[in-house]
Interface confidence: low
């Protein structure tokens, strides 16, 4: 039985040209995290594998930085970066946990961070 929960930064907003940190945290499970995938819709952004470290997809290499921790930093944001982002935790023996973050990139200087929420 999967008992863990994923806590994410929830719905967030940031300014065009700026940076944002996408963060997820897996709790309430003793399962071993073998790999975390960061995906945007159907595109793979980055992978952090417990044994092999970080891999950033070539098409995102210039604008995506690993960390902090298992999080991901998006840089030089554009309006096209608006959308859903998913952290996918591959664990042993539980299986897969998925967290969702919605990022809105704003033209203006008004960018408020949303509240945290949990996905069981």
């Amino acid at each position: 039985m999967m008992t863990g929960t994923i806590e994410t930064t929830g719905n967030i907003s940031a300014e065009k040209g700026g940076s944002i940190i996408l963060q997820c945290h897996l709790s309430s499970t003793t399962a071993q995290v073998t790999q975390v995938n960061w995906e945007q819709q159907d595109q793979l952004l980055a992978i952090c594998n417990a044994d092999l470290g970080w891999h950033i997809s070539p098409s995102f290499k210039d604008r995506v930085a690993p960390g902090p921790g298992l999080g991901l930093t998006l840089q030089s944001l554009t309006v096209n970066d608006t959308g859903e982002y998913f952290c996918i935790y591959h664990t042993y023996p539980d299986g897969t946990y998925t967290g969702r973050i919605f990022l809105e990139v704003l033209e203006s200087s008004v960018a408020e961070h949303g509240a945290r929420f949990q996905i069981p």
């Epitope: 044994d51 092999l52 042993y92």
Partner: antibody, heavy 120, light 108 residues
Framework: QVQLVQSGAEVKKPGASVKVSCKAS????????ISWVRQAPGQGLEWMGW????????NYAQKLQGRVTMTTDTSTSTAYMELRSLRSDDTAVYYC?????????????WGQGTLVTVSS | AIQLTQSPSSLSASVGDRVTITCRAS??????LNWYQQKPGKAPKLLIY???SLQSGVPSRFSGSGSGTDFTLTISSLQPEDFATYYC??????????FGQGTRLEIK
């Protein structure tokens, strides 16, 4: 194009050591892991372990722990596998393979293989 | 370690036949299953990754399906160059990668 070129065939006596090299080209060496797989004559594939070219982390198959060491030289984009205390049942073709991230760590490129014969 | 059992161990088929090879895992591995083709004296070649994704450059007659513990490799219409040995491999447990024992596909 991606290429993995391995060192030549070796003949060793029982109790000796062998070191096989695998020179990578055509991609960013430190962005991927190198796995080693062996195949005894007429037998199936056996995973030996892997090394992260990113951070040097290693992960060895349980049955080989204590006898195998995997290393990389990032300056020459070369991976090495050393097997010690050789026995006759270590006679096999040894392959290096790149662990493809987008392929969920499937081995997307392979070296040509190195035949290691252990015989007194 | 997670064990993979392929069936059949060998089979004979003719050019043009539809062929199915199965791979069963000893526990759920999600979709972390890959398929390889190996010809005598050559290194294995990745055909299918993530259970059903076709590796670049591989003909579309090859397809994969399954999730959890049961997986299938299908060749829709056998070509002469397809006679080889096929292996499944799991990468779910990254601490202990394992391969199936192989399926030898021979000409009838």
């Amino acid at each position: 194009q991606v290429q993995l070129v391995q060192s030549g065939a070796e003949v060793k006596k029982p109790g000796a050591s062998v070191k096989v090299s695998c020179k990578a080209s055509g991609y960013t060496f430190t962005s991927y892991g190198i796995s080693w797989v062996r195949q005894a004559p007429g037998q199936g594939l056996e995973w030996m372990g892997w090394i992260s070219a990113y951070n040097g982390n290693t992960n060895y198959a349980q049955k080989l722990q204590g006898r195998v060491t995997m290393t990389t030289d990032t300056s020459t984009s070369t991976a090495y596998m050393e097997l010690r205390s050789l026995r006759s049942d270590d006679t096999a073709v040894y392959y290096c393979a790149r662990a493809g991230w987008e392929q969920q760590l499937g081995f997307d490129y392979w070296g040509q293989g190195t035949l290691v014969t252990v015989s007194s | 370690a997670i064990q993979l059992t392929q069936s059949p161990s060998s089979l004979s088929a003719s050019v043009g036949d539809r062929v199915t090879i199965t791979c069963r895992a000893s526990q759920s591995i999600s979709s972390y299953l890959n398929w390889y083709q190996q010809k005598p004296g050559k290194a294995p070649k990745l055909l299918i990754y993530a259970a059903s994704s076709l590796q670049s450059g591989v003909p579309s007659r090859f397809s994969g399906s399954g999730s959890g513990t049961d997986f299938t490799l299908t060749i829709s219409s056998l070509q002469p160059e397809d006679f080889a040995t096929y292996y499944c491999q799991q990468s779910y447990s990254t601490l202990a990668i394992t391969f199936g024992q192989g399926t030898r596909l021979e000409i009838k």
